[in-house]
């Protein structure tokens, strides 16, 4: 005998009694597929999470992060604090990138400026906390007497901010 539960559509669940009637999901629960024997509890978007899509009887709520945080994980299961460009997140809060390192994102960590001299090039534009250096032509390509804008940037060694 075919399981009559399979006839219960999304938004309902199959009752446990012999008639196996389809019962609508109670408030704050949902079933996204047919034939479910129970409805799932709706996800609650609380704390640093905010509601992106409300829960319905057929689909779970979707969350994203409140302003000043960014999502991590499948379906935004985690929220991590943003920092400004030129900073990285540590346990003590957002810290400026150390000299010689930069971060052009609101998330992530500082990384060292490119060492133009490793490619035989010179520094065309200095690096900042928010931007990498811009490498220009090699010193040999410059006209006689010309020199690079600044001395070569430090080698790309990791920064040293506690985290």
């Amino acid at each position: 005998i075919q399981d009559s539960c399979s006839k219960c559509p999304a938004g309902t669940f199959c009752g446990k009694n012999k008639s196996q009637i389809c019962i609508p999901c109670p408030p704050n629960s949902f079933s996204s597929t047919s034939g479910q024997k129970a409805c799932d509890i709706c996800r609650q978007c609380e704390g640093v999470f905010r509601t992106k899509k409300v829960c319905s009887s057929t689909s779970n709520a979707e969350c994203d992060c409140i302003s000043g945080f960014h999502c991590l994980g499948a379906g935004c299961t985690m929220c991590e604090q943003d920092c400004k460009q030129g900073q990285e997140l540590t346990k003590k809060g957002c810290k400026d990138c150390c000299f010689g390192t930069f971060n052009d994102q609101k998330r992530g960590i500082c990384r060292p400026w490119t060492n133009c001299s490793l490619d035989g090039k010179s520094v065309l534009v200095n690096g900042t906390k928010e931007r990498d250096v811009v490498c220009g032509p090699s010193p040999a390509d410059l006209s006689p007497g010309a020199s690079s804008v600044t001395p070569p940037a430090p080698a790309r060694e990791p920064g040293h901010s506690p985290q």
Epitope: E80, G108, I109, P112, H160, S161, P162, Q163
Partner: antibody
Framework: QVQLVQSGAEVKKPGESLKISCKGS????????ISWVRQMPGKGLEWMGK????????NYSPSFQGQVTISADKSISTAYLQWSSLKASDTAMYYC?????????WGQGTLVTVSS | DIELTQPPSVSVAPGQTARISCSGD??????AHWYQQKPGQAPVVVIY???NRPSGIPERFSGSNSGNTATLTISGTQAEDEADYYC???????????FGGGTKLTVL
């Protein structure tokens, strides 16, 4: 949705070279760090190193510095882990993971077997 | 670079509380993260930034971190919690991530 898909299992002989891959999709591949993690048979997780695909900046765990090379091709959203000369002790499952501290997405793993 | 030390194994009866420690010099100065790994699967974050629980991870999982020890606590342990658990941290000094050696949790 975000996915990291790794290349298939490899069986190699000692001294051979190898390059395995990790293709990202569903997010801005260039702006998230990719880490590589080793798990030898029956053992724990070991962080090997990481790469920022946007500019291919890498840094390595001291234990793996000089033993492997991590690279990336942002045009095809793919990170790589390579060996120039494999040893039997390189036999392990290798995972790529998104992130540098919190690893929120993981590849399915690539099993590398090195045996004569 | 920091070394993280975990007990190789912890056993707990169903419904009881399991505590898994992760020791390292001044680990409390850095964020600790915890991963669960079941056989044949990739690891999954169960606690991040010392004490935050990702959505979808049961409330029985909690974490703390101060001084030289981070701790993962599983209250009312269930059979499905049997797995390997790894602590991890990221240190800005050298820009390195480190995993603990892992703890096999057995639910008796």
């Amino acid at each position: 949705q975000v996915q990291l898909v790794q290349s298939g299992a490899e069986v190699k002989k000692p001294g051979e070279s190898l390059k395995i891959s990790c293709k990202g999709s569903g997010y801005s591949f260039s702006t998230y760090w990719i880490s590589w993690v080793r798990q030898m048979p029956g053992k724990g997780l070991e962080w090997m190193g990481k790469i920022y695909p946007g500019d291919s900046y890498t840094n390595y765990s001291p234990s793996f510095q000089g033993q492997v090379t991590i690279s990336a091709d942002k045009s095809i959203s793919t990170a790589y882990l390579q060996w120039s000369s494999l040893k039997a002790s390189d036999t392990a499952m290798y995972y790529c993971a998104r992130g540098y501290g919190i690893f929120d997405y993981w590849g399915q793993g690539t099993l590398v077997t090195v045996s004569s | 670079d920091i070394e993280l030390t975990q007990p190789p194994s912890v056993s707990v009866a169903p419904g009881q509380t399991a505590r898994i420690s992760c020791s390292g010099d001044n680990i409390g100065d850095q964020y600790a993260h915890w991963y669960q790994q079941k056989p044949g699967q990739a690891p999954v974050v169960v606690i991040y930034q010392d004490k935050n629980r990702p959505s979808g991870i049961p409330e029985r999982f909690s974490g703390s971190n101060s001084g030289n020890t981070a701790t993962l606590t599983i209250s009312g342990t269930q059979a499905e919690d049997e797995a390997d658990y790894y602590c991890a941290t990221y240190t800005g000094f050298g820009s390195l991530a480190v995993f603990g050696g892992g703890t096999k949790l057995t639910v008796l």
